[in-house]
Amino acid sequence: APTSSSTKETQEQLDQLLLDLQVLLKGVNDYKNSKLSRMLTFKFYMPKKVTELKHLQCLEEELKPLEEVLNLAQGKNSHGGNTRESISNINVTVLKLKGSETFMCEYDETVTIVEFLNRWITFCQSIISASSS
């Protein structure tokens, strides 16, 4: 059974993941329309369902393409460091949260970068609210 300290740790990690995803989404939405409309041609893969922590495997698998698209959009822009830091944070947090159980992602949908970040933000929020109630 999970201890109160491990539950608290999970909660903190989810809070951190949520924050980093929100930072990335804000960065994307802050781009001038010319950049954003170009970013929206890129595809990101979403699984059939995201309801459990093990499903974070599917987020992990899309982190490299996500970083590449954000780097392309930034070019020589000074926000590059923020993106790298957020992606790195997400990587570390996801590894902690998803556990060691191997999970095979079944992707059934392709979405834009904005939809992708919003879906994972919603996932974090729903897990946080479920675990705190």
Partner: antibody, heavy 117, light 109 residues
Framework: EVQLVQSGAEVKKPGESLKISCKGS????????IGWVRQMPGRGLEWMGT????????RYSPSFQGQVTTSADKSISTAYLQWGSLRASDTAMYYC??????????WGQGTMVTVSS | SYELTQPPSVSVSPGQTARITCSGD??????AYWYQQKPGQAPVLVIY???ERPSGIPERFSGSSSGTTVTLTISGVQAEDEADYYC???????????FGGGTQLTVLG
């Protein structure tokens, strides 16, 4: 109604210059890319390049880089495509189209350019 | 430079299903778009983001994607669907747009 209206057909001689236009209406012209597409007689569509009217940021297909110039005057919601020196091989229909997150969703009626001596 | 490959022509009888494919190396990561062009007319968007249909486009038009290939499917083809169809996407950097060579759909009979 959202629309793009292009300038009329042109007949030119080789070596002459030309500037054709594409006027947008019914939407915020500044904040959508305008693409230019060539269609030579009996052939397919070829992407030439795009311009973002708000800041005149441009992208050209490698095939058209240096051959044509795109520009825009956001004060009159108009994009332009121009040639410094036309060739017979520039004879084609030229379309402008609005690029949104859902692709080239609005197209102009096309401008036929004929280059012949 | 980046290319999208389509079959030059597809023929189908009225009421049958027509499938037009488009292949390109960047398609696993770039959305594809489909346009219909009838003689003497400007192209019209029929499918965007691989599978989405703009309002006003009949339900018989649908799109799908698998790996490096996207497919435009027209179910229950009608005579008015006879046209050229072009796929369009971007290169892997999202910088350059490109059109496929086009597919002429002929409705037999």
């Amino acid at each position: 109604e959202v629309q793009l209206v292009q300038s009329g057909a042109e007949v030119k001689k080789p070596g002459e210059s030309l500037k054709i236009s594409c006027k947008g209406s019914g939407y915020n012209f500044d904040t959508y890319w305008i693409g230019w597409v060539r269609q030579m007689p009996g052939r397919g569509l070829e992407w030439m390049g795009t311009i973002y009217p708000a800041d005149s940021d441009t992208r050209y297909s490698p095939s058209f880089q240096g051959q044509v110039t795109t520009s825009a005057d956001k004060s009159i919601s108009t994009a332009y495509l121009q040639w410094g020196s036309l060739r017979a091989s520039d004879t084609a229909m030229y379309y402008c189209a609005r690029f949104s997150s859902s692709a080239y969703d609005i197209w102009g009626q096309g401008t036929m350019v004929t280059v012949s001596s | 430079s980046y290319e999208l490959t389509q079959p030059p022509s597809v023929s189908v009888s009225p009421g049958q299903t027509a499938r037009i494919t488009c292949s390109g190396d960047a398609l696993p990561r770039q959305f594809a778009y489909w346009y219909q062009q009838k003689p003497g007319q400007a192209p019209v968007l029929v499918i965007y983001k691989d599978t989405e249909r703009p309002s006003g486009i009949p339900e018989r038009f649908s799109g799908s994607s698998s790996g490096t290939t996207v497919t435009l499917t027209i179910s229950g083809v009608q005579a008015e669907d006879e046209a050229d169809y072009y796929c369009q996407s971007a290169d892997s950097s999202g910088t350059y747009h490109v059109f496929g060579g086009g597919t002429q759909l002929t409705v037999l009979g």
